[in-house]
Interface confidence: low
Amino acid sequence: TLNSVLINSNAIKNLPPPLGGAGGQPGSAVSVAPGVLYEGGNKYQTLDNYQPYPCAEDEECGSDEYCSSPSRGAAGVGGVQICLACRKRRKRCMRHAMCCPGNYCKNGICMPSDHSHFPRGEIEESIIENLGNDHNAAAGDGYPRRTTLTSKIYHTKGQEGSVCLRSSDCAAGLCCARHFWSKICKPVLKEGQVCTKHKRKGSHGLEIFQRCYCGEGLACRIQKDHHQASNSSRLHTCQRH
């Protein structure tokens, strides 16, 4: 039984580390109160209200973040890794995940992505946590609960709905976002489209559905005519800055 609350996400702040290393019982998820949605800052949030988000690996962070120990002097408990904002082009890096979408790490510097730069399989291996429900009904061999995958660079970028590991796998105008326990290419949001804001305070439900971020020049804000609605059902839409 999957007794989970499906929570959507706009800025793609991915799953919190699974409890007990295996997400509890097979097919179960960390539950939060029904109807409780994340609200609060997204990729445009200011440092004042930013809540550090603990992580164990890059895949648990948003597409515009990577997982690392905060530098000395930064807020955060010693030894704990948190999701940090990705590094823009020409900034220093140690691995691809540190660079913002559309960039990769070459010779310690974030460079614009160009498929000719990527020999097949150069991107580091990504771990996908498979929180299975029931049995894994594979046509052929069974698959382990935790699968290590070498991230493939496709000659053809992923179209809407196709599987991806990170946003650079997706065609222009799409980002890589979680859908159930997978990640698929979804459209970057346009003006007026529904988005989801994150609080990251205390709520640790599994984010089974995610939305892309709002497109350039847009921010995820509460819809004007929904102020009367209860907090849990307020709609946010992508609006001009």
């Epitope: 007794n3 929570i7 029904p34 409780v36 894994n136 009904a137 698959y143 599987v163 709609l235």
Partner: antibody, heavy 118, light 112 residues
């Protein structure tokens, strides 16, 4: 273009078994998770089961009413989705649709009719 | 066992606008800002018209729009045309055993 063609439907007695197939073409089958949705005669749509792609370990999902009786599987080499239906009941009578679940059910087959009757 | 409630039928004249409602609970439609709408003509397969509350897949007319407030989602069809006559189903996600839930369907009749 995306095409999904179901087959394997027919008349079966209560308690019997049937295996539905769905042949997919026009897209990279292995990159999408796939679903079965059914529709009883004159009734609404009901989600039955879903299976993810290889990268997610072929995780399977079932509606409560079919869990333990139905098994979803896929053969990526044949671009085919399957639904093995055992211990069939009269209430399983429906048109069974195979659907690609990209962003929600974005492409559907034309359906295959399963009739469970004695 | 219908999880989402829709009116059995609605009707409108060509050129008019109609709205179909879809009501759920905080455990399904009200809990998540994810609602899809499907159109189904008699004897045909369903077709995705709206996803994520108000997004249209490519190829779907901009006469179709979606919205949501609280536990209720709505599909609005403006400038009604004869070919819009069909059954319409809402769909959302849910906590608990059934992860995908549909509405009971609404038959849209275009008068005249």
């Amino acid at each position: 273009q995306v095409q999904l063609v179901e087959s394997g439907g027919g008349l079966v007695q209560p308690g019997g078994s049937l295996r539905l197939s769905c042949a997919a073409s026009g897209f990279t089958f292995s990159s999408y998770w796939m679903s079965w949705v059914r529709q009883a005669p004159g009734k609404g749509l009901e989600w039955v089961s879903s299976i993810e792609h290889k990268d997610a370990g072929y995780t399977t999902w079932y509606a409560a009413g079919v869990k333990g009786r139905f098994t979803i599987s896929r053969d990526n080499s044949k671009n085919t989705l399957y639904l093995q239906m055992n211990s069939l009941r009269a209430e399983d009578t429906a048109v069974y649709y195979c659907a690609r679940h990209g962003i929600d059910f974005d492409h559907w087959g034309q359906g295959t009719l399963v009739t469970v009757s004695s | 066992d219908i999880a989402l409630t829709q009116p059995a039928s609605v009707s409108g004249s060509p050129g008019q606008s109609i709205t179909i409602s879809c009501t759920g609970t905080s455990s399904d439609l009200g809990g998540y800002n994810y609602v899809s709408w499907y159109q189904q003509h008699p004897g045909k397969a369903p077709k995705l018209m709206i996803y994520d509350v108000n997004n249209r897949p490519s190829g779907v007319s901009n006469r179709f729009s979606g919205s949501k407030s609280g536990n209720t989602a709505s599909l609005t069809i403006s400038g009604l045309q004869a070919e819009d006559e069909a059954d319409y189903y809402c769909q959302s996600y849910a906590s608990g055993n059934t992860k995908v839930v549909f509405g009971g369907g609404t038959k849209l009749t275009v008068l005249g």
